[in-house]
């Protein structure tokens, strides 16, 4: 089941999926001046059986003689600056992608692919957070988020991570600032369907956290 929302935003942090659950979709996007080949795949899909998972379909880009009309292939002008986040500065949690059954590795690049990857995660996907260069972590718990489904609504758990500037004075554990997630879902807003207290999506993904080998947009 697709996650119909995005991992929460943690200021000054990026996140990465170490492996992708079966059912994950990756848009076949091409860089400016290129387009998907006619009758080419729209998505790559992580599929598999109990013993092996792999990406179905191959993304292929070709030079576009005419203007590329595919929507959102490149970042909007106001998003350009945000989306230049690169790979996390230090190693992520030691998760061996190959050892996770029912998961796919990061797909290899394809020729002339776009500068960002747009993934569509599924319920059960886990992403790991890390502070960007120049910030250090104050942990209150796991620096990870999982997409869960309750009453037919999907939501991501809130990672217990605060990233503070190197020069800032560390706070004592009891004095940590609250998570800066302006539209984070209060615990009181977790009742069942068709009420005004349905799960609200944690703050929509900010591109400052979009990261993988390429910059990544998570859908």
């Amino acid at each position: 089941e697709l996650c119909d929302d995005d991992p929460p935003e943690i200021p000054h942090a990026t996140f990465k999926a170490m492996a992708y659950k079966e059912g994950t979709m990756l848009n076949c996007e091409c860089k400016r001046g290129f387009r998907r080949i006619k009758s080419g795949s729209l998505y790559m899909l992580c599929t598999g059986n109990s013993s092996h998972s792999s990406w179905d379909n191959q993304c292929q880009c070709t030079s576009s003689a005419t203007r590329n009309t595919t929507k959102q292939v490149t970042p909007q002008p106001e998003e350009q600056k945000e989306r230049k986040t690169t790979e996390m500065q230090s190693p992520m949690q030691p998760v061996d992608q190959a050892s996770l059954p029912g998961h796919c590795r990061e797909p290899p690049p394809w020729e002339n692919e776009a500068t960002e990857r747009i993934y569509h995660f599924v319920v059960g996907q886990m992403v790991y957070y890390q502070c960007v260069q120049g910030y250090r972590a104050l942990h209150r718990g796991p620096a990870e988020s999982v997409c869960k489904m309750t009453h037919g609504k999907t939501r991501w758990t809130q990672p217990q991570l605060i990233c503070t500037g190197e020069m800032e004075t560390s706070q004592f554990p009891g004095e940590e600032k609250p998570q800066a997630s302006p539209e984070g879902r209060p615990e009181s807003e977790t009742s069942c369907l068709v009420t005004t207290t349905d799960f609200q999506i944690q703050t929509e993904m900010a591109a400052t956290m979009e990261t993988s080998i390429f910059t990544t947009e998570y859908q």
Epitope: K153, T154, R155, F199
Partner: antibody
Framework: QVQLVQSGAEVKKPGSSVKVSCKAS????????MHWVRQAPGQGLEWIGY????????EYNQKFKDKATITADESTNTAYMELSSLRSEDTAVYYC?????????WGQGTLVTVSS | DIQMTQSPSTLSASVGDRVTITCSAS?????MHWYQQKPGKAPKLLIY???ELASGVPARFSGSGSGTEFTLTISSLQPDDFATYYC?????????FGQGTKVEVK
């Protein structure tokens, strides 16, 4: 309570465009994707696509990618869907539906009639 | 795309009847969701994640199935249940619906 109120019925000429609105209230607009669904007369439901209101990111059903353009205005908590190059086959009721999983709230629908 | 095939397309039944609607997906999916629609109205969520009843939905409705075959059952049809029912998958894009099953008075 959560409400999605759509704009009124439209009658359009072939080749023209129409912009349908969906005003949300009763929840944090930017916290949920807004999806659009089409229903031609006497037919079933077809998913058109969605928008993430606070980022403007859209995902479309390939069938509608050259037909529909979904936008949103955070300041008015309103999502829009513009249909271009209208043809008689575009005559349908268009619904907005709140995402975040299953579609728990729907607009009342907007009938777009394309006729010369 | 995942195609959703509902059967029957039309079902004639009487109040008190047990009604079963099936939905077959062209590929395996995680869950099925069901909506009810009455003429001139927007669809209404009926059952989510295959078997869970949406808020306010009577217990005479139930859902079951897995993989590619799913079923919606109304144990004892009531006058308010005459409507069109749609199955829906959101396991992969594009999201798709069944063509609908109209439950009409026999």
């Amino acid at each position: 309570q959560v409400q999605l109120v759509q704009s009124g019925a439209e009658v359009k000429k072939p080749g023209s465009s129409v912009k349908v609105s969906c005003k949300a209230s009763g929840y944090t607009f930017t916290s949920y994707r807004m999806h659009w669904v089409r229903q031609a007369p006497g037919q079933g439901l077809e998913w058109i696509g969605y928008i993430r209101p606070n980022r403007g990111y859209t995902e479309y059903n390939q069938k509608f990618k050259d037909k529909a353009t979904i936008t949103a205005d955070e300041s008015t908590n309103t999502a829009y869907m513009e249909l271009s190059s209208l043809r008689s086959e575009d005559t349908a009721v268009y619904y907005c539906a709140r995402g975040g999983g299953v579609f728990d709230y729907w607009g009342q629908g907007t009938l777009v009639t394309v006729s010369s | 795309d995942i195609q959703m095939t509902q059967s029957p397309s039309t079902l004639s039944a009487s109040v008190g009847d047990r009604v079963t609607i099936t939905c077959s997906a062209s590929s395996s999916i995680s869950y099925m969701h069901w909506y009810q629609q009455k003429p001139g109205k927007a669809p209404k969520l009926l059952i989510y994640t295959t078997s869970e009843l949406a808020s306010g939905v009577p217990a005479r409705f139930s859902g079951s199935g897995s993989g590619t075959e799913f079923t919606l059952t109304i144990s004892s049809l009531q006058p308010d249940d005459f409507a069109t029912y749609y199955c829906h998958q959101r396991s992969t894009y594009p999201l798709t619906f069944g063509q609908g099953t109209k439950v009409e008075v026999k």
